[in-house]
Interface confidence: low
């Protein structure tokens, strides 16, 4: 908390400019009018304030808007957003996509912070729905955001959003989510050639049906065991030994190490022993 002191003569700020970086914290508190700050928030980011000085500016805005900042101020917060707590953000009513983008840009390159999670929650609730533009924006900044959505919410995700997704962003998705995402990925990547297509679709294959796995087995994709182990059991069971051998290529030897785990275990039990023996891995059905 900054002590209330009178502003020294001649130091009253008439506008938010670079001269303020030389003000001590108490001088900022005393000499910068909160209403002036609110109307010139867009200038703050161009000025190299210290974190301590930013704390003072935040304090002034908090006093001016105890019920929460208006969107006109929020949109221009810039780096001051990093000073906000989830509690601060819960008071906001953010409805403009431009505001959301501006604040996500500030946090870009970092993990989704509690502040950002709260901001997104406030924005989506304010809009009343997860529309295409919102999803496009969120997945552009946080592709991992997809896995935090329910299958019902995911059904409205446009295939174009899938382009920004990286394999690690699907790590937290469960099979029900992948069931919804896989057809979208298939559509998004449909014009790519075989090997490039497999590189892109690989992360989504936990939602692939049997017929698509059969088709992939004809394309020399050499699926690794980690991917195979994430496939739907019901999709793997109808595959023949020959199809699995083609699907895995040189990785087929890895089946031995996974023979007690699903889906390999269940698949082995469905095969004729004669067919399993052709693999030469000692798998017992």
């Amino acid at each position: 908390e900054v002590e209330k002191t009178a502003c020294p003569s001649g130091k009253k700020a008439r506008e938010i400019d670079e001269s303020l970086i030389f003000y001590k914290k108490w001088e900022l508190e005393a000499c910068v009018d909160a209403a002036l700050l609110a109307t010139q928030m867009d200038r703050v980011n161009a000025i190299p304030f210290t974190y301590e000085q930013l704390d003072v500016l935040k304090h002034k805005l908090d006093e001016l808007y105890p019920q929460g900042y208006p969107e006109s101020v929020i949109q221009h917060l810039g780096y001051l957003f990093l000073k906000m707590s989830p509690e601060d953000i819960r008071k906001w009513n953010v409805t403009s996509l431009e505001t959301l983008k501006a604040l996500l840009e500030v946090n870009k390159g970092h993990e989704m912070s509690p502040q950002v999670a709260t901001l997104i929650d406030r924005f989506v609730k304010g809009r009343g729905q997860l529309d295409k533009d919102t999803l496009d924006t969120l997945t552009a900044f946080y592709p991992g955001y997809l896995c935090s959505l329910s299958p019902e919410e995911l059904s409205s995700v446009p295939p174009s959003s899938i382009w920004a997704v990286r394999p690690q962003d699907l790590d937290t998705c469960d099979p029900r989510q992948l069931d919804v995402l896989y057809p979208k990925a298939r559509l998004a990547f449909q014009n790519m050639n075989g090997s490039e297509y497999f590189v892109k679709i690989q992360s989504f294959l936990g939602g692939a049906p049997t017929e698509d796995l059969k088709a992939l087995s004809q394309q020399n994709v050499s699926m690794d065991l980690a991917t195979f182990m994430k496939l739907r059991t019901d999709a793997v069971l109808p595959l023949t030994v020959a199809e699995v051998q083609k699907l895995l290529g040189p990785h087929v030897e890895g089946l031995k190490a996974e023979e007690r785990h699903r889906p390999v275990r269940d698949w082995i039990l469905r095969q004729r022993q004669d067919d399993l023996d052709t693999l030469g891995l000692g798998l017992q059905g």
Epitope: K101, D136, A140, S160, W163, A188, F189, N191, E196
Partner: nanobody, 127 residues
Framework: QVHLVESGGGSVQAGGSLRLSCAAS????????MGWFRQGPGEEREGLAQ???????KYADSVKGRFTISKDNAKNILYLQMNSLKPEDTGLYIC?????????????????????RGQGTQVTVSS
């Protein structure tokens, strides 16, 4: 497949401006992202700018503040507004529709994963 055709190149004095256009047609025009890269005399490729269909733009340090990428989604035309041109900006400017929107990959090699690309439009900046 996506078909890309660039236009707007030409010769200009240092400090001048040019606006390049890239008309896109085909069945995947509205998805993913699009970008511009420059091919120099020695065939070296330099990723310059990229824009996602949600209009988030990225720029290489060498052109930041001078070049602006934009896209008219209704007409499927990609633009590159180039101001304060320098002699080192000379090259063949090529429009591409990367199959992967990774900016870092685009900077390393604009043709990673062999995306659709145009034939290019030549820009010559003289001092």
């Amino acid at each position: 497949q996506v078909h890309l055709v660039e236009s707007g190149g030409g010769s200009v004095q240092a400090g001048g401006s040019l606006r390049l256009s890239c008309a896109a047609s085909g069945d995947r025009v509205s998805t993913g992202c699009m970008g511009w890269f420059r091919q120099g005399p020695g065939e070296e490729r330099e990723g310059l700018a990229q824009i996602h269909n949600y209009n988030i733009a990225k720029y290489a340090d060498s052109v930041k503040g001078r070049f602006t990428i934009s896209k008219d989604n209704a007409k499927n035309i990609l633009y590159l507004q180039m101001n304060s041109l320098k002699p080192e900006d000379t090259g063949l400017y090529i429009c591409t529709a990367p199959v992967d929107c990774s900016w870092s990959m685009f900077l390393q090699d604009p043709l990673a994963l062999s995306p659709p690309r145009g034939q290019g439009t030549q820009v010559t900046v003289s001092s």
